[in-house]
């Protein structure tokens, strides 16, 4: 679970150790602030739960790619 260290900065201190199915993911955001100990991805699931993930892991990168492509593909 991400932690807000102040109103402007949210950090991840631990990463999920479970791969999340891409069908459960709605969006993501990158955590790059130097105020945080780790660079991270926060996935938001379709039930609005936020999960911290390690951007160095391939499944995380693949999920980001999938979501990026999804947002640029016009829905028919």
């Amino acid at each position: 679970q991400p932690d807000a260290i102040n109103a402007a900065v949210t950090c991840c201190y631990n990463f999920t150790n479970r791969k999340i199915s891409v069908q459960r993911l709605a969006s993501y955001r990158r955590i790059t602030s130097s105020k945080c100990p780790k660079e991270a991805v926060i996935f938001k699931t379709i039930v609005a739960k936020e999960i911290c993930a390690d951007p160095k892991q391939k499944w995380v990168q693949d999920s980001m790619d999938h979501l990026d492509k999804q947002t640029q593909t016009p829905k028919t």
Epitope: T32, S34, K56
Partner: antibody, heavy 117, light 107 residues
């Protein structure tokens, strides 16, 4: 705050090698990737490659593959870039930079490498 | 490699002008692009990454837009400290590539 401090300018002969260091403070380098980008005089920016200091996995632009070695020492929070078989076209400012996502939030001050006979 | 073509290569503008720099990727990069500002003798500085994420401390007069292969950096009202060279960069796939740069000069 995050700081990346690079080693000083170098003058090298063609055919030789150069090793540039980049010491990080204000961050744990194993939590990021360390990249190297170069800029020839009056030219644009060129990504060379990166290392994951966690496991020493590297990725390079194929253009530099075989000629560049990127290493990292997590105990000293230092990344290194060694370029071999130097030629005059390698004269450039070499920058280290950090970032997991493929863009670069923090940069070193740059190290000028001059290759001249 | 994904080639990034930036235009114009240079432009002259006055303080207060609206300035637009464009970058075209040779394939879809799905908003995975960044913009940097570089002043002579200095390292580049990250301005914007991804769809619209303005780096902390970057003035709101800088904005990024675009999708697919076409992206734009806009400076809504040019300030004296904005005269510099600007680079776009794609981070959709390695090797990460930069545009050729746009030098913004004083008219």
């Amino acid at each position: 705050q995050v700081q990346l401090v690079q080693s000083g300018a170098e003058v090298k002969k063609p055919g030789s090698s150069v090793k540039v260091s980049c010491k990080a403070s204000g961050l744990t380098i194993s939590h990021t990737y360390m990249h190297w980008v170069r800029q020839a005089p009056g030219q644009g920016l060129e990504w060379m490659g990166r290392i994951d200091p966690d496991n020493h996995n590297t990725k390079f632009d194929p253009k530099f593959q075989g000629r560049v070695t990127i290493t990292a020492d997590t105990s000293t929070s230092t990344a290194y870039m060694e370029l071999s078989s130097l030629r005059s076209e390698d004269t450039a400012v070499y920058y280290c930079a950090r970032g997991v996502f493929g863009f670069f939030e923090h940069w070193g001050q740059g190290t000028t490498v001059t290759v001249s006979s | 490699d994904i080639q990034m073509t930036q235009s114009p290569s240079s432009l002259s503008a006055s303080v207060g002008d609206r300035v637009t720099i464009t970058c075209k990727a040779f394939e879809d990069i799905y908003n995975r692009r960044a913009w940097y500002q570089q002043k002579p003798g200095k390292a580049p500085k990250l301005l914007i990454h991804g769809a619209t994420s303005l780096e902390h401390g970057v003035p709101s007069r800088f904005s990024g837009s675009g999708s697919g292969t076409d992206y734009t950096l806009t400076i809504s009202s040019l300030q004296p400290e904005d005269f510099a060279t600007y680079y776009c960069q794609q981070f959709w796939s390695a090797p990460y590539t930069f545009g050729g740069g746009t030098k913004v000069e004083i008219k």
